[in-house]
């Protein structure tokens, strides 16, 4: 590692970002007293003056909701955070630069399975983001990613699964056994970006054949 | 007022290594990126790197990576370029640069020579 | 690498006259997020480490004086003295930060005619 820490008030300033949230977060060194308080400040790159975040001054959470401040996800992002406590001086700690666009993670999706006799449809929601667009409208993932897809799973059993993927939000595994457990999985890819979310999940069984 | 000073510069043999500070004052190193810059006699600029004093991470001009290498120690204020294997081009005055994109501070540059 | 080209090399000027500076750049220098173009302007005089007159292409540095302007999009951009002084003898250099690694231009020499 190329940089000595020995201040010990402050430690780990970094962005988690999943679906374009982007939040601000950061630990207290060994240091830190009760009465620490810290302060945020942000700014894009290139620009020369830090903006300081109404709400995350002199507070005492570790974290910092910094969504609107960021909501560009074509734009890189620093933010700072300055830590003061009785007796000492301030320390000041910034974060590598931030892309949401880059560094964001992709929640899984929100998804319906509806179960037939002999089928099971899974339906995908649209996930909003904080991102606007030019009209400022909330943008989808679909929206930001124009490469994203869904995989779909359907473990039949220990040894067989039925796969599907594409671009649409509806899809149906037909040929199914009524009367039977399924689980079902769905996951979001972005390939350009080499996204992947955790899978969303279901256990559905299928109806039971009346006729 | 923000300050940086440079020092460690001076004649090494080729193959030799240095290393260079950078003494920042009137604020934190920890607020803003450092950049080493360099700039052979007669000649123009040539920038090596970066570093977030902050966190550690480093860019570099692939032209120095594995030769030069960026740190910093946040208690002294200080950013440091270690160069290894010096060769007769590495001639210039090495300056350390303030900020992430373009360079609103710079130090008064310090001299390297390598001869034999 | 984007290479950054100068023009001219030097330039002689008599004091109170106009002296442009030209840079062109290898590839557009044009930041979509802000429409605004990654270009800085440095002076450098004798003995003295470059100092910061110009950033993003056209906005000026904290007390710089106004006969400094930059201008330009793209690919070609423009530093322009309006009436020389005898204080504004040095080398001028333009610099990129739209890539790593960030790049300058050879220097332009400004000298009184």
């Known amino acids: 590692h190329t940089t000595e820490d020995t201040s010990g008030l402050l430690r780990h300033v970094k962005f988690q970002s999943s679906n374009f949230e982007n939040i601000l977060t950061w630990d207290a060194g060994p240091a830190s007293a009760p009465d620490t308080v810290y302060s945020v400040e942000y700014k894009k790159y290139g620009e020369k003056e830090w903006l300081a975040k109404a709400g995350c001054q002199r507070i005492t959470q570790k974290f910092c909701n910094l969504t609107v401040e960021t909501r560009n996800h074509t734009e890189f992002y620093y933010a700072k955070v300055t830590a003061v406590s009785s007796g000492g001086p301030p320390v000041t700690k910034m974060t590598d630069r931030f892309s949401s666009l880059q560094h964001t993670t992709i929640r899984p999706p929100d998804v319906t399975c509806i179960p037939k006799v002999r089928s099971i449809q899974m339906l995908v929601h649209p996930t909003l983001t904080p991102v606007l667009s030019e009209d400022g409208h909330q943008l989808t993932l679909e929206e930001i990613f124009h490469d994203l897809f869904y995989r779909l799973k359907l473990h039949v059993n220990h040894t067989y699964q039925m796969n599907l993927e594409g671009k649409q939000r509806e899809y149906e595994f037909l040929g199914l056994t009524p009367d039977t457990e399924f689980l079902g999985s769905i996951t979001i890819l972005t390939p350009i970006l080499s996204k992947e979310s955790a899978p969303y999940t279901c256990r559905v069984k299928t109806l039971p054949d009346r006729t | 007022e923000v300050q940086l000073v440079e020092s460690g510069g001076g004649l090494v043999q080729p193959g030799g290594s240095l290393r260079l500070s950078c003494a920042a004052s009137g604020y934190s190193i920890t607020a803003e990126y450092m950049n080493w810059v360099r700039q052979a006699p007669g000649k123009g600029l040539e920038w090596i790197g970066e570093?977030?004093?902050?966190?550690?991470?480093?860019t570099y001009n692939q032209k120095f990576k594995g030769r030069f290498t960026i740190s910093v120690d946040q208690s002294k204020n200080t950013a440091y370029l270690q160069m290894n294997s010096l060769r007769a081009e590495d001639t210039a005055v090495y300056y350390c640069?303030?900020?992430?994109?373009?360079?609103?501070?710079w130090g008064q540059g310090t001299l390297v020579t390598v001869s034999s | 690498d984007i290479v950054m080209t100068q023009s001219p090399d030097s330039l002689a000027v008599s004091l109170g006259e106009r002296a442009t500076i030209n840079c062109k750049s290898s590839?557009?220098?044009?930041?979509?997020?802000?429409?605004?173009?990654?270009l800085a302007w440095y002076q450098q005089k004798p003995g003295q480490p470059p100092k910061l007159l110009i950033y993003w292409a056209s906005s000026r540095e904290s007390g710089v004086p106004d006969r400094f302007s930059g201008s330009g999009s793209g690919t070609d951009f423009t530093l322009t003295i309006s009436s020389l002084q005898a204080e504004d003898v040095a080398v001028y250099y333009c610099q990129q930060y739209y890539s790593y690694p960030f790049t300058f231009g050879q220097g332009t020499k400004v000298e009184i005619k």
């Open positions: 570093i977030n004093p902050s966190t550690g991470t480093t």
């Open positions: 640069a303030r900020f992430d994109a373009y360079f609103d501070y």
């Open positions: 590839q557009s220098l044009l930041y979509s997020s802000n429409q605004k173009n990654t």
